[in-house]
Amino acid sequence: LPAQVAFTPYAPEPGSTCRLREYYDQTAQMCCSKCSPGQHAKVFCTKTSDTVCDSCEDSTYTQLWNWVPECLSCGSRCSSDQVETQACTREQNRICTCRPGWYCALSKQEGCRLCAPLRKCRPGFGVARPGTETSDVVCKPCAPGTFSNTTSSTDICRPHQICNVVAIPGNASMDAVCTSTSPTRSMAPGAVHLPQPVSTRSQHTQPTPEPSTAPSTSFLLPMGPSPPAEGSTGD
């Protein structure tokens, strides 16, 4: 015979636990239904009646199956140095991240307390380590044979173009100038940018190796955003 399905509320067998999406109510000493994300427990269960759930009010949320008496308050509106990357809904908190060109200098438990603008590398210097959502840009001097002529948080040092006849030799902040109408091969077709940090979650970018004689074509791209951490409403 198939096992009889118990409907909530029910008294669990001694030593057993309640099923998924149920919780044990200490007062009623019964297994009772949890409320779904976006809801909270309006009335707790008794021996004869199950949990009564109600929708979260505006600006409040529950992210998980729960039996909390009140929904959690969404965080305050994003400040001027941040952008809202996830809106406050009944099922999720608002997420604020630093705007493009900024990084989270001071973090808090959830989100960012204070954003700061990314440093930029000046001419003669290139990006050694790009900024991430939680770390600043690191610059390095352009090695002999390479240059950067920009003030940028993304540009790396690029190799000088190779000339048949050099009119003006390149230096750390300027490309070589050729006398012939065109160089034998242009090593620097355009500014090479490191990927900008995408303002969602922290990412791990690796430093791009310094090009020695030939430009690198395989840049290490940042990994995609990691999934958000689970909320704290209990499962």
Epitope: A105, L114, A116, R119, R122, V137, T150, T151
Partner: antibody, heavy 125, light 109 residues
Framework: QEQLVESGGGLVTLGGSLKLSCKAS????????ISWVRQAPGKGLEWIAY????????DYATWVNGRFTISLDNAQNTVFLQMTSLTAADTATYFC??????????????????WGPGTLVTVSS | IKMTQTPASVSAAVGGTVTINCRAS??????LAWYQQKPGQPPKLLIY???DLASGVPSRVKGSGSGTEFTLTISGVRCDDAATYYC????????????FGGGTEVVVK
């Protein structure tokens, strides 16, 4: 030579308006953030607003309350501060300032390494 | 974030040492700068990131501290050090109550 020069200050009547200019030279203007900072006679420094030309972002101190607007003319390498509803409390020397260009190769917008000489604004009744 | 500087004024003898304190109302890690301002001039950056010396600043000027407590120390004080000194946190946005401290006047005797 990296330089910032303010202009447009002067005497203005209570409730009046004034537009200050900050002309930049010798810097990569489109990549540098510019802030306005003021100093009332005998008082301390007070940050007003900033603008980042390459990101087009602006922000203001809370006390500004919509009375001031920061803007820029990229072609002229100039940042402006439009001030309205001026009161006696706005009497100050107004400085424009930009980030710190370090010898180790970076430009850090968090700190003010380059300042203009300032322009005096006097609000009289 | 609110920045509070102490003392408001301090006097020092030539060759002596001056210590100026700056307190942040909340943790700002090491995102702090110090400036020197003389009458009729704009401020000059002395220290950034709490302890790094700006270009051209003599090594007798020292910045220290992190979190909420910061100190500027000038040793071997010279007449030229007579000025007002300001601290500044690196987060100038509309969320900041005061970006700069109130200033400390240094008088050299």
């Amino acid at each position: 030579q990296e330089q910032l020069v303010e202009s447009g200050g002067g005497l203005v009547t209570l409730g009046g308006s004034l537009k200050l200019s900050c002309k930049a030279s010798g810097i990569d203007f489109s990549s540098y953030g510019i802030s306005w900072v003021r100093q009332a006679p005998g008082k301390g420094l007070e940050w007003i607003a900033y603008i980042y030309p390459d990101y087009g972002s602006t922000d203001y101190a809370t006390w500004v309350n919509g009375r001031f607007t920061i803007s820029l003319d990229n072609a002229q390498n100039t940042v402006f501060l439009q001030m309205t509803s001026l009161t006696a409390a706005d009497t100050a020397t107004y400085f424009c300032a930009s980030g710190y260009a370090s010898s180790s190769g970076y430009y850090d917008p968090k700190y003010f390494g380059l300042w203009g000489p300032g322009t005096l604004v006097t609000v009289s009744s | 974030i609110k920045m509070t500087q102490t003392p408001a004024s301090v006097s020092a003898a030539v060759g002596g040492t001056v210590t100026i304190n700056c307190r942040a109302s909340e943790d700002i890690e090491s995102y702090l700068a110090w400036y020197q301002q003389k009458p009729g001039q704009p401020p000059k950056l002395l220290i950034y990131d709490a302890s790094d010396l700006a270009s051209g600043v003599p090594s007798r000027v020292k910045g220290s501290g992190s979190g909420t407590e910061f100190t500027l120390t000038i040793s071997g004080v010279r007449c030229d050090d007579a000025a007002t000194y300001y601290c500044q946190h690196g987060f100038y946005t509309s969320r900041s109550d005061s970006v700069f401290g109130g200033g400390t006047e240094v008088v050299v005797k």
